[in-house]
């Protein structure tokens, strides 16, 4: 009931708790001498459902039949309205609409660990919308019974607080849950189980790993388990992998040897336990152990390439480059690279350890036959050395690949194609495609990239260290024994018109013609490979179309003569540059007047 109901009563029939779809009768009646002063026939009783009027009656009582109430709680309040005064609250009632409980389903019980307590869960079924009490009952051998009640609004779990022990692991226990509310009751089907069925072991703990003689091939995993554990599942994976390796072991007694781990790899290990071959459930997985396996000596061989540069009549510069071993080949942290340079006829050799980078430059005589060997070393040993005889890679003209082309292939890729050399193509043992950013000064500090291609291939897609709007000098080498031939081309993955034209820095007169000199366009403004320069000129103050001269682009060229200018006429000159995408804006303008005699 709501408030003290001093002035009257509200009664609800058949009950304050009703089944969904039922009808209730609500009666509001005034107590004696609680009506409107003087005029009892002017008593107006009004029935509210929440804050809306739903019925009224003049007199001492009001009877109202109510249908269609929704699930949940509905509040009814009865008020008295007298002439010329505010309504007075008489009394009220809450009506609870719900359903009888459904049969609880999927009752299952578990004891976490040998020392844990029995707890059960079930599915309640649809919400009753009413206060519903759940009673869980467990009966065991020797007529032992335990009971626990739950009065939470949403009850689907109860812990008996008792511990089943392994003295008689085959003894049967039966659990049942009963739901009761004002509209009915329902019991689950009984669930019968033994100790072995419901005890779920605690996950293993104190997991450790040992590598005998710091070797990955002699690895043992150790852990601790509850006393009755019979089975274990081990799972392990490299930390950067999503796929687990799984091993099932019986009577492991807290240790297992792992034979297939990779060296120098961080692994994650987890273990789970079970008490019986086919009864009960697996424990949760243990906390992860993360451990790095020991190093092993590197496998595989370095991919080595080189460049030769003429210094003077007696000396040459050799630059060696090599690629890092893959993680699976390095099998550890590479501490240094060992480079051995040897003159083959004289037997002189020098060895150097290189740390921190993957290149080495030295100067050697131009005479003699030279060879290099490069290997990678970690804490356990060295890779097999890669041996290379130093030769003139472009000496054999007949081995030069033909019709080399370089075309953009999607984002930041260049497709290089070629035809085999004229000399017997079957003599080619491999092709090497080499690329580096084009720098007008021929800067040897620019990083070198290369890839190897089988002798039957006539194309290669280069994508490593390729940037948009940068021109690359690309060489294709055909190697055969101790001979090599090469061809080169310029290429870019993406291009647009250059951002600026060349800057004319000087115009000089020579025997009736002029020589124009210019500064190269900065690399970052070229926007790809330059194809041509154009020199424009026209008479000053003239509205005529300018004349032009187009010069094919060559890396080292930065001057060009023009001999079609008239003497004693002042000309304005400027330059532009072109890529395959178009022409740059004008460079600076220069005026010049040829002083030579008129013809």
């Amino acid at each position: 009931k709501i408030d003290a109901c001093k002035r009257g009563d509200v009664t609800v029939k058949p009950s304050h708790v009703i089944l969904l779809g039922s009808t209730v009768n609500i009666t509001c009646s005034l107590k004696p001498r609680q009506g409107c002063f003087h005029y009892s026939r002017r008593n107006k009783l009004i029935l509210y459902k929440f804050d809306r009027r739903i019925n009224f009656h003049h007199g001492h009582s009001l009877n109202s039949q109510v249908t269609g109430l929704p699930l949940g709680t509905t509040l009814f309040v009865c008020k008295l309205a007298c002439i010329n005064s505010d309504e007075i609250q008489i009394c009220g009632a809450e009506i609870f609409v719900g359903v009888a409980p459904e049969q609880p389903q999927n009752l299952s019980c578990i004891q976490k660990g040998e020392q844990g307590t029995v707890a059960c869960t079930w599915e309640r079924g649809r919400d009753t919308h009413l206060y519903t009490e759940y009673t869980l009952q467990l009966s065991g051998p020797k007529n032992l019974t335990w009971q626990k009640q739950c009065k939470d609004i949403y009850c689907d779990y109860l812990d008996f607080g008792i511990n089943l022990t392994p003295e008689s692991p085959e003894s049967n226990f039966t659990a049942k849950v009963t739901a009761v509310n004002s509209l009915g009751s329902s019991s689950s089907l009984p669930s019968t189980f033994t100790f072995l069925d419901i005890v779920r072991p605690l996950p293993p703990w104190d997991i450790r790993i040992k590598f005998q003689k710091a070797s990955v091939s002699r690895c043992t995993l150790y852990w601790r388990d509850e006393g009755l554990v019979l089975l274990n599942r081990l799972r392990y994976r490299p930390s950067n992998s999503r796929l687990w390796n799984m091993v099932n072991v019986t009577k492991a007694k807290g240790r297992h040897d792992l034979l297939d781990l990779k060296p120098f790899t961080e692994y994650e290990f987890q273990i789970s336990s079970k008490l019986h071959l086919y009864k009960g459930s697996w424990s949760d997985w243990s906390e992860s152990l993360r451990a790095q396996t020991p190093e092993e000596e590197p496998t595989g061989m370095l991919d080595v390439w080189y460049m030769k540069r003429h210094i003077d009549y007696s000396r040459q510069q050799i630059s060696l480059f090599w690629k890092n071993l893959s993680v699976s080949e390095a099998r550890g942290k590479i501490l240094h690279y060992q480079v051995t340079l040897q003159e083959l006829t004289g037997g002189k050799a020098m060895t150097q350890n290189i740390t921190g980078h993957t290149s080495w430059t030295t100067v050697i005589p131009r005479t003699g036959n030279w060879a290099v060997a490069v290997s990678a070393a970690n804490s356990k040993g060295s890779s097999l050395p890669t041996r290379i005889n130093i030769m003139n890679l472009c000496e054999a003209g007949l081995l030069a690949p033909r019709q080399v082309s370089a075309n953009s292939e999607g984002m930041d890729n260049i497709l290089v194609t070629w035809q085999p050399p004229r000399k017997d193509p079957s003599a080619v043992q491999e092709y090497v495609v080499e690329w580096r950013e084009l720098h007008p000064g021929g800067d040897t500090q620019v990083p070198l990239n290369w890839l190897r291609s089988r002798p039957y291939n006539v194309s290669a897609l280069i994508s490593e260290n390729i940037k948009s709007y940068i021109c690359y000098e690309i060489r294709v080498y055909a190697l055969s024994g101790d001979q090599g031939g090469c061809s080169s081309i310029l290429g870019n993955s993406k291009h647009k018109a250059p951002l600026s034209g060349p800057h004319i820095n000087a115009i000089t007169e020579e025997k009736g013609s002029i020589l124009i000199s210019w500064n190269s366009i900065p690399v970052q403004e070229q926007m790809g490979c330059l194809l041509h320069y154009r020199i424009y000129w026209k008479e000053r103050d003239s509205n005529s179309q300018p004349q032009l001269c187009e010069i094919p682009y060559r890396v080292s060229q930065n001057s060009h003569p023009i001999n079609s200018l008239q003497p004693r006429v002042t000309y304005v000159l400027w330059m532009t540059a072109l890529t395959a995408a178009g022409e740059s804006s004008h460079g600076n303008e220069r005026e010049f007047c040829l002083q030579g005699k008129a013809n």
Partner: nanobody, 123 residues
Framework: QVQLQESGGGLVQPGGSLRLTCVAS????????MSWVRQPPGKGREWISA????????DYADSVMGRFTISRDNAKNTVYLQMNSLKSEDTAAYYC????????????????WGQGTQVTVSS
């Protein structure tokens, strides 16, 4: 769903009479109090009368007291409004509604109103 169908409106001279009828369906009529509401042209709605679920108590707005009579027949799911001594200010569209949606206390909900019937009082 709730349906209310009004009828009986028309053109009548001042001082004349009309009887409006409202037939209800889609809900248990006998358990619901009912109201009549009107809306003069260009004005807001005005509750004018109500009858409780049993038909034994009625209420009227002061503007129609003594001239209008509300009644119901639960067997026919019907509520009536007998209008006598009509005046020109009674000209309006007349609607019936469930009392819980429109009473002298609160007539803000149009959830269960019918389509209405037009009453015009004019000479």
């Amino acid at each position: 769903q709730v349906q209310l169908q009004e009828s009986g409106g028309g053109l009548v001279q001042p001082g004349g009479s009309l009887r409006l009828t409202c037939v209800a369906s889609g809900f248990p009529f006998s358990t619901h109090a009912m109201s009549w509401v009107r809306q003069p042209p260009g004005k807001g709605r005005e509750w004018i009368s109500a009858i409780n679920s049993g038909g034994d108590s009625t209420d009227y707005a002061d503007s129609v007291m003594g001239r209008f009579t509300i009644s119901r027949d639960n067997a026919k799911n019907t509520v009536y409004l007998q209008m006598n001594s009509l005046k020109s200010e009674d000209t309006a569209a007349y609607y019936c509604a469930k009392y819980e949606d429109c009473s002298d206390y609160d007539c803000s909900s149009r959830a269960s109103w019918g389509q209405g019937t037009q009453v015009t009082v004019s000479s």
